[in-house]
């Protein structure tokens, strides 16, 4: 056993190359210099080491860097990254987006592992916020990233980062998440002109309040029915027939096909049948003529 700990004569590795795949685990431990390994980490990925051999290489790096690996090593970990534990990763200080991309590439196409989740957490905390470039990178690898975050986590996304969000990144977000993202998008896109603004804000409108929908109705935006159906019911209900007509423009005809579905159904119930008739779509279920409409919520607020 004692002899095995010493490197056999002529076996000392002058560099990291393919010949090392024939080394037994104890030979790798004894014959590969940890500092050499650290400087030539980029070569490891090209060599078909077994999992057991990778364990040895990781052990050597752990001994060399007990406080955590430097970024120069982390960037070239490649498949060795899969051997890291969240505890290992918590010791790292990753600041380069290139390093993050290199490690995400290793896990590409697979569900996010605890290691990747820890890496992202460390990276974002190190940057202080989820900035535009980071968000761009994360959504490229993980299209559902934003919609997997809690509203609390989303609240820390700065408005400037919203420019990195593509419509498909929001496809599976729920209303509570959009409630958080919408005000940020509104702020981010506030200096754009009417039609350009609408194109950008459209995917976020599931979080829009009534007053913003009223404002949009004055801008000839021609909202499509798919977007309208994703609006908050409580935001749609106070809109008048005229406002909905202006908001939807030529798409207003689509209301007929959706008259039994929320939010259209609930909105119809709040409108006077006379007003609905002016659309000429045959929408039924409005408040009959001559009925008095009491706004109970207003009454409660006053009492």
């Amino acid at each position: 056993e004692v002899e095995k700990t010493a490197c056999p004569s002529g076996k000392k590795a002058p560099e990291i190359d393919e010949s090392l795949i024939f080394y037994k685990k104890w030979e790798l431990e004894a014959c590969v210099d940890a500092a050499l390994l650290a400087t030539q980490m980029d070569r490891v990925n090209a060599i078909p080491f077994t999992y057991e051999q990778l364990d040895v290489l990781k052990h050597k790096l752990d001994e060399l860097y007990p406080q955590g690996y430097p970024e120069s090593v982390i960037q070239h970990l490649g498949y060795l990254f899969l051997k890291m534990s969240p505890e290992d990763i918590r010791k790292w200080n990753v600041t380069s987006l290139e390093t993050l991309k290199a490690l995400l590439e290793v896990n590409k196409g697979h569900e996010m592992s605890p290691q990747v989740a820890t890496l992202i957490d460390r990276f974002v905390k190190g940057r202080g916020q989820l900035d535009k470039d980071t968000l761009d990178t994360l959504t490229a690898f993980y299209p559902g990233y934003l919609c997997s975050l809690s509203p609390e986590e989303l609240s820390s996304v700065p408005p400037s980062s919203i420019w990195a969000v593509r419509p498909q990144d929001l496809d599976t977000c729920d209303p509570r998440q959009l409630d958080v993202l919408y005000p940020k998008a509104r702020l981010a896109f506030q200096n754009m002109n009417g039609s350009e603004y609408f194109v950008k804000i459209q995917s976020f409108l599931g979080g829009a309040p009534t007053e913003d929908l009223k404002a949009l109705s004055q801008q000839n935006v021609s909202m499509d029915l798919a977007t309208f159906m994703k609006l908050r019911t409580d935001a749609v209900l106070p809109l008048t027939v005229a406002e909905v007509q202006k908001l939807l423009g030529p798409h207003v005809e689509g209301l007929k096909a959706e008259e039994r579905h929320r939010p259209v159904r609930d909105w119809i119930l709040r409108q006077r049948q006379d007003d609905l008739d002016t659309l000429g779509l045959g929408l039924q279920g409005g408040i009959p003529n001559g009925y008095l409409v009491l706004d109970l919520s207003m009454q409660e607020a006053l009492s």
């Epitope: 196409g109 697979h110 569900e111 996010m112 592992s113 605890p114 990747v116 989740a117 994360l138 993980y142 299209p143 559902g144 990233y145 919609c147 997997s148 975050l149 809690s150 509203p151 609390e152 986590e153 599976t172 729920d174």
Partner: nanobody
Framework: EVQVVESGGGLVQPGGSLRLSCGVS????????MRWYRQTPGNQREWVAS????????GYADSVKGRFIISRDSAKNMMSLQMNSLKSEDTAVYYC?????????WGQGTQVTVSS
């Protein structure tokens, strides 16, 4: 392969309670948000409630707020929806939805019927 399975649906009288469960098997490893949606015939799916990956914070549709409670057991990859004070308009097929950073997974649904 990730599988999502709902259970617990059934027939209940107005004002009654029911508890739905959702089990997830497969390699859902980190950062997943779990949601309940429901769908009535001819209608689009409607969001009911969510429980988020970090800290277990929750969100509810206005129509169920104060009546339904969503909870999860991350260790067992389970989620449940406690439905109280049920109304006839809660009748629907209830679907469990698991959102990961990479994908969205749906169950086959469980029927809830509220009727006297």
């Amino acid at each position: 392969e990730v599988q999502v399975v709902e259970s617990g649906g059934g027939l209940v009288q107005p004002g009654g309670s029911l508890r739905l469960s959702c089990g997830v098997s497969g390699s859902i490893l980190a950062l997943n948000t779990m949601r309940w949606y429901r769908q009535t015939p001819g209608n689009q799916r409607e969001w009911v409630a969510s429980i988020y990956s970090s800290g277990g914070s929750t969100g509810y549709a206005d129509s169920v707020k104060g009546r339904f409670i969503i909870s999860r057991d991350s260790a067992k990859n389970m989620m449940s929806l406690q439905m109280n004070s049920l109304k006839s308009e809660d009748t629907a097929v209830y679907y469990c939805n698991v959102q990961t950073p990479l994908n969205v997974y749906w169950g086959q649904g469980t029927q809830v019927t509220v009727s006297s």
